[in-house]
């Protein structure tokens, strides 16, 4: 029995930050779980982890240097990624694992979300065009 995950097909990070919501066909209330976000087609980089426990505060961390935070809904986890670089444009996959109560459950691999990180372009304002060329 697998949990189904829904993600937006694509998100654009205009200000080098993005909220990626992972929606599950499973209620996480009073469960011990590990929700994670993985980068790349092969999910090789674990970007962020949200650990939830019925008796403890939510714990969020990244072992790979990403600036991330997480929020929990009954059937969702939202990852908030900040300080993204243009070269981190990639496909990102949500993963959910329920550790307790037994049996262990995880998800069918989702379709993923392409996060397109737009660089901050410092364009001259039309009101202040800057120095004209001689």
């Amino acid at each position: 029995n697998k949990i189904l995950v829904k993600q937006s097909p694509m998100l654009v990070a205009y200000d080098n930050a993005v909220n990626l919501s992972c929606k599950y066909s499973y209620n996480l209330f009073s469960r011990e779980f590990r929700a994670s976000l993985h980068k790349g087609l092969d999910s090789a980089v674990e970007v962020c982890v949200v650990y939830g426990n019925y008796s403890q505060q939510l714990q969020v961390y990244s072992k790979t240097g990403f600036n991330c935070d997480g929020k929990l809904g009954n059937e969702s986890v939202t990852f908030y990624l900040q300080n993204l670089y243009v070269n981190q444009t990639d496909i990102y996959f949500c993963k959910i694992e329920v550790m307790y109560p037994p049996p262990y459950l995880d998800n069918e691999k989702s379709n993923g979300t392409i996060i397109h990180v737009k660089g901050k372009h410092l364009c001259p304002s039309p009101l202040f065009p800057g120095p004209s060329k001689p």
Partner: antibody, heavy 120, light 107 residues
């Protein structure tokens, strides 16, 4: 009380086999990785293998890959290390330890260790 | 694999001394560094996790810090029970690896 208790160590000839056991108690077995870490006489600590009993995912150090097999029985809250094709350099005290599956970075509880001696 | 280089390999000190042990990672492991104490014939015990967090029940004379890929374990005032071997361990990437150990002896 949270406890890990190893057993199964002993003297074995090169090329022989041995199975170590690690009985866990006092915590939710499926919330933790179980690891084997060894220490050769007078040497430092070396991580050997790990298993997450929830989904039976395993990892091995290159030095034991293909020779050692880690497994777990959730009905008995026990992990095992099956050691085949043993070599003199496998001689060590073998410790069973745990790390949290959701917060996996340190080994917070250790067993007392079991001694494996590979010698002819 | 990530290499952990610990220094010094041995150290002589007296009760009441302030002692520092260093561990260097071969690549950036962020805060994912732990310290253990081991006494002869016994299993290691966790002292510090995530570079600077004191594990439950560990005396406050033990502390840890990080500067880039360099990590430090400090014992502010050595007690007789602190003479032991100390190991660092990286918990960022499998295979988890340990430093070679620092043996702290009585001067």
């Amino acid at each position: 009380e949270v406890q890990l208790v190893e057993s199964g160590g002993g003297l074995v000839q090169p090329g022989g086999s041995l199975r170590l056991s690690c009985a866990a108690s006092g915590f939710t077995f499926t919330s933790y990785y179980i690891h084997w870490v060894r220490q050769a006489p007078g040497k430092g600590l070396e991580w050997v293998a790990s298993i997450y009993p929830g989904n039976v995912a395993t990892r091995y150090a290159d030095s034991v890959k293909g020779r050692f097999t880690i497994s777990a029985d959730t009905s008995k809250n026990t992990a095992y290390l099956q050691m085949n094709s043993l070599r003199a350099e496998d001689t060590a005290v073998y410790y069973c330890t745990r790390s949290h599956y959701g917060l996996d970075w340190n080994f917070d509880v250790w067993g007392q260790g079991t001694t494996v001696t590979v010698s002819s | 694999d990530i290499q952990m280089t610990q220094s010094p390999s041995s150290l002589s000190a007296s009760v009441g001394d302030r002692v520092t042990i260093t561990c260097r990672a071969s690549q950036n492991i962020y805060v994912w560094l732990n310290w253990y104490q081991q006494k002869p014939g016994k299993a290691p015990k966790l002292l510090i996790y995530k570079a600077s967090n004191l594990y439950s029940g560990v005396p406050s004379r033990f502390s840890g810090s990080r500067s880039g890929t360099d990590f430090t374990l400090t014992i502010s005032s050595l007690q007789p029970e602190d003479f032991a071997t100390y190991y660092c361990q990286q918990g960022q990437t499998y295979p988890y690896t340990f430093g070679q150990g620092t043996k702290l002896e009585i001067k």
